[in-house]
């Protein structure tokens, strides 16, 4: 037997950007409290699975009211340790969940409104009797600093609290076969004597003189196997030879307890032990209240303390469902316009916009030409989130800053020679061709292939085209 102890040092905003808002306001002052849940082993268990090693709730911290405009500081904490007693051996490896809860102190419905601010979890190895272990855990934008240890309750000692110690009977040494109890050198290890004859394989004891059976075994010395088959006898005392325990018609047959309640027989009838959130003779009445902490993912629980009261969970962005248990894929609604990329950050939605678009949802089409000058007489043309310059003759490049070589594209057809000119280019045509780009063949009879002669000229008159 022993006690797991948890000391919370601080709870406040973690390092880095995105400091959380203070959980309390001037209108609704609040205070913090903590819950710790311990489970044996290193298994990754759901937060809702039982706290098999035990659980504890802290006292309420001092009332805190936010200073308007101030960032959330480290919040005032409850006094004292959280202590989780354990009856059996300390397992050495354990999983923990530490929850930080906010209790509002406004004009409440019938009980305080509670909401889970942060939940941290981890798996650790820890020997009982060792020093305090320090830890820092982050949950979203919050940071929790704490220390923990496991210590044995006398007379238990050892890394698992399974050895028992007694004060020495003789001042000099311990009895035959018994060692001194480190670190209590003035005490001796005490033999744990179970009931005489208790099966060493199937029985064990936590107190001297007892004999407790492992599952599947029965009898005063745990030597009789429990079998529910190969038994022909009716309901009644178990057979000493076979150990058969055949259930007959009893008040708990068929389990009359609803909603996962467990049934135990009483002298007159039966009794249901109901799970959290249910009550009534057969656990048939649902009575979840905010005290049961039904809201997940930082949801705020609002409702009365009476089991008949309704409750509602006010959900933070990104969660939905009656208990805020479902994550919303907000990007599936395609909120980002103009081809923007949607990012769901949990606490907020972000749109990464394509070039030329801006705004929370990329809804603003930027004036691509605003502040964009095209040099050398070029004109800016908008389109598709990017700007383009239509350059004046003789210039090129993105901003018309480059002097273009008009002959680079070989604009003169049929072997014409190209000459750069201040106003553009000039083609000197090869014999038999004419036109600004030497594109027209001259017919042998002196007429050109032009569809019609320019006004004032007769076909066959000499023409000159540059």
């Amino acid at each position: 037997a022993g006690v797991f102890e948890l000391q919370i040092h601080s709870f406040g905003p973690g390092p880095g950007p995105g400091a959380p808002r203070s959980p309390c306001s001037a209108r609704l002052p609040c205070r913090l409290f903590f819950r710790v849940c311990l489970k044996p082993g290193l298994s990754e268990e759901a937060a809702e699975s039982p706290c098999a090693l035990g659980a504890a709730l802290s006292a309420r911290g001092p009332v805190y009211t936010e200073q308007p405009g101030a960032p959330a500081p480290d919040l005032p904490l409850p006094d004292g340790l959280l202590q989780v007693p354990f009856r059996d051996a300390w397992p050495g490896t354990f999983s923990f969940i530490i929850e930080t809860w906010r209790e509002e102190l406004g004009d409440q419905i019938g009980g305080p409104a509670w909401s889970l601010l942060a939940r941290v979890a981890g798996r650790r190895r820890l020997a009982a009797g060792g020093p305090w272990a320090r830890d820092i855990q982050r949950a979203g934008a919050w940071e929790l600093r704490f220390s923990y240890r496991a210590r044995c309750e006398p007379p238990a000692v050892g890394t698992a609290c399974t050895r028992l110690c007694r004060p020495r009977s003789a001042p000099s040494r311990c009895g035959p076969g018994l060692r001194p109890c480190a670190p209590l050198e003035d005490e001796c290890e005490a033999p744990l004597v179970c009931r005489a004859g208790c099966s060493p394989e199937h029985g064990f004891c936590e107190q001297p003189g007892e004999c407790r059976c492992l599952e599947g075994w029965t009898g005063p010395l745990c030597t009789v196997p429990v079998s529910t088959s190969s038994c022909l006898s009716p309901r009644g005392p178990s057979s000493a030879t076979t150990g058969c325990l055949v259930p007959g018609p009893g008040p708990c047959d068929g389990n009359p307890c609803a909603n996962g309640g467990s049934c135990s027989e009483t002298p007159r009838s039966f009794e249901c032990t109901c799970p959290r959130g249910f009550y009534g003779l057969r656990c048939e009445v649902s009575g979840v209240t905010c005290a049961d902490g039904p809201c997940f993912n930082g949801g705020l629980c609002v409702g009365g303390a009476d089991p008949d009261s309704a409750y509602i969970c006010h959900c933070p962005p990104g969660f939905q469902g009656s208990n805020c248990e479902k994550r919303v894929d907000r990007c599936s609604l395609q909120p980002c316009r103009n081809g923007g990329l949607c990012l769901d950050l949990g606490h907020a939605l972000r749109c990464r916009c394509r070039a030329g678009f801006a705004g929370p949802r990329c809804e603003h089409d930027l004036d691509d030409c605003a502040g964009r000058a095209c040099a050398n007489g070029g004109t800016c043309v908008e389109g598709g989130g990017a700007h383009r310059c239509s350059c004046a003759l003789g210039f090129g490049g993105r901003d018309c800053r480059e002097r273009a070589d008009p002959c680079a594209a070989r604009p003169c057809a049929h072997g014409g020679r190209c000459y750069a000119h201040f106003s553009g280019l000039v083609c000197a045509c090869a014999p038999g061709y004419m036109g600004a780009r030497c594109e027209f063949p001259v017919h042998p009879d002196g007429a050109s292939a032009l569809p019609a002669a320019p006004p004032g000229l007769r076909p066959g008159d000499p023409q000159r085209y540059l």
Epitope: L28, V302, I312, H314
Partner: nanobody
Framework: EVQLVESGGGEVQPGGSLRLSCGPS????????VGWVRQAPGKQRNLVAG???????NYAQSVKGRFTISRDNAKNTVYLQMSSLRAEDTAVYYC?????????WGQGTLVTVKP
């Protein structure tokens, strides 16, 4: 300070019906959780019915199947349709709204169920 205003209360016989309204008010927006809270003489306040900001409804065990809560976001109004009324439903009914930072209450409307 903006307050919620309830209407529709009154005296009714057992088995009768009433419809309570709250609003219109700029407080009653889709990002708020809203509900109806009642307080019988000598008893504590209890949430009878509520609609969360994500649209989930919940009812007190004693009114399930008899009361229906609804909201009209366009009209900024919340309603409570009460039928098959019983003597134990006699109470002052308050309209309630809240978000993470604030909570809002109405002055209450009295519902009396008596033969």
């Amino acid at each position: 300070e903006v307050q919620l205003v309830e209407s529709g209360g009154g005296e009714v016989q057992p088995g009768g019906s009433l419809r309570l309204s709250c609003g219109p008010s700029e407080i009653i927006t889709s990002d708020k959780s809203v509900g109806w809270v009642r307080q019988a003489p000598g008893k504590q306040r209890n949430l009878v019915a509520g609609i969360s900001n994500v649209g989930s409804t919940n009812y007190a065990q004693s009114v399930k199947g008899r009361f229906t809560i609804s909201r009209d976001n366009a009209k900024n109004t919340v309603y409570l349709q009460m039928s098959s009324l019983r003597a134990e439903d006699t109470a002052v009914y308050y309209c309630y709204a809240r978000d993470f930072e604030n909570e809002y209450w109405g002055q209450g409307t009295l519902v009396t169920v008596k033969p």
